[in-house]
């Protein structure tokens, strides 16, 4: 396997930002973008945003979708604009799925 050389300035991407953590902003800049869906008190909560810390994104994005939460991640400017995370449908499992998109 190839060892990744340390990046002095990691590539940052512009991401759509939607949800409480965005404040008044409609975009953010980070090392990855995401679109998420979670169920909170029976309500579907959709969020979009960015991961400023690469390792946080890597950990979150490798988490497989569950009945209560799904995250889709991507790298590329505005790459999460047209991504809507979806929860796994009943009776379907997603072994080994990768919720990650490169643009």
């Amino acid at each position: 396997m190839e060892d990744e050389k340390p990046k002095v300035n990691p590539k940052l991407y512009m991401c759509v930002c939607e949800g409480l953590s965005c404040g008044n902003e409609d975009h953010c800049e980070g090392q990855q973008c995401f679109s998420s869906l979670s169920i909170n008190d029976g309500f579907h909560v959709y969020q979009k945003g960015c991961f400023q810390v690469y390792e946080q994104g890597k950990m979150t994005c490798k988490t497989p979708p569950s009945p209560g939460q799904a995250v889709e991640c991507c790298q590329g400017d505005w790459c999460n604009r047209n991504i809507t995370a979806q929860l796994p449908t009943k009776g379907k499992s997603f072994p080994g799925t990768q919720n990650f998109h490169l643009e």
């Epitope: 990744e4 810390v53 950990m59």
Partner: antibody, heavy 119, light 107 residues
Framework: EVQLQQSGAELVRPGASVRLSCTAS????????MHWVKQRPEQGLEWIGW????????KYAPNFQSKATITAVTSSNTAYLQLSSLTSEDSAIYYC????????????WGQGTSVTVSS | DIQMTQSPASQSASLGESVTFTCLAS??????LAWYQQKPGKSPQLLIY???SLADGVPSRFSGSGSGTKFSFKISSLQAEDFASYYC?????????FGGGTKLEIK
């Protein structure tokens, strides 16, 4: 119960290489990033790097880029640290640690492996 | 690299007292900071993550505060088992870096 069991102490000659192991139980290393940290006697902690065992991606501190190689074998739930061209400066305790959500930091550490470089 | 400056390097205190340590980052790191406790011959143990959040199983006498570049760590009402070394660590940007540590000794 989450545990990280590291291999035993090593006494090695200058110029040689050594490979340390860290075997996880209570969780699957594919679901984490596995880190290594160096601590010299009476000194502080130095982060060496991490591996994502799921895809093999690694990231190293610049000081360890040519010194350390981190690998993982998911079938045995084990991460490895190989140190090359050893000198007395490499004599230290080396810890493996797990990084996972929701902490997004190193929440469980191994007991450490002592490496002594001496002729 | 982000430098983490921790102070004091050592401190003496008595049982029941409160102590506070500080950690300064050379650039802003938001709340991407952890605090660890290390006892002689043992591995570090996570106490605080995300600058202010208490890790599972950690007593509430430990607390963290701060964001940006200045962070504090407090132990209120010191217990005998609290005498150890403490390290801060930034996990915002690789290479992740630790403070030099604070050795807390019994007075």
């Amino acid at each position: 119960e989450v545990q990280l069991q590291q291999s035993g102490a090593e006494l090695v000659r200058p110029g040689a290489s050594v490979r340390l192991s860290c075997t996880a139980s209570g969780f699957n290393i594919k679901d984490s990033l596995m880190h290594w940290v160096k601590q010299r006697p009476e000194q502080g902690l130095e982060w060496i790097g991490w591996i994502d065992p799921e895809d093999g991606e690694t990231k190293y501190a610049p000081n360890f880029q040519s010194k350390a190689t981190i690998t993982a074998v998911t079938s045995s739930n084990t991460a490895y640290l190989q140190l090359s061209s050893l000198t007395s400066e490499d004599s230290a305790i080396y810890y493996c640690a797990r990084y996972t959500s929701p902490y997004y930091t190193m929440d469980y550490w191994g007991q450490g492996t002592s490496v002594t470089v001496s002729s | 690299d982000i430098q983490m400056t921790q102070s004091p390097a050592s401190q003496s205190a008595s049982l029941g007292e409160s102590v506070t340590f500080t950690c300064l980052a050379s650039q802003t790191i938001g709340t991407w900071l952890a605090w660890y406790q290390q006892k002689p011959g043992k591995s570090p143990q996570l106490l605080i993550y995300a600058a202010t959040s208490l890790a599972d199983g950690v007593p509430s006498r430990f607390s963290g505060s701060g964001s940006g570049t200045k962070f504090s760590f407090k132990i209120s009402s010191l217990q005998a088992e609290d005498f150890a070394s403490y390290y801060c660590q930034q996990v915002y940007s690789t290479p992740w870096t630790f403070g030099g540590g604070t050795k807390l000794e019994i007075k």
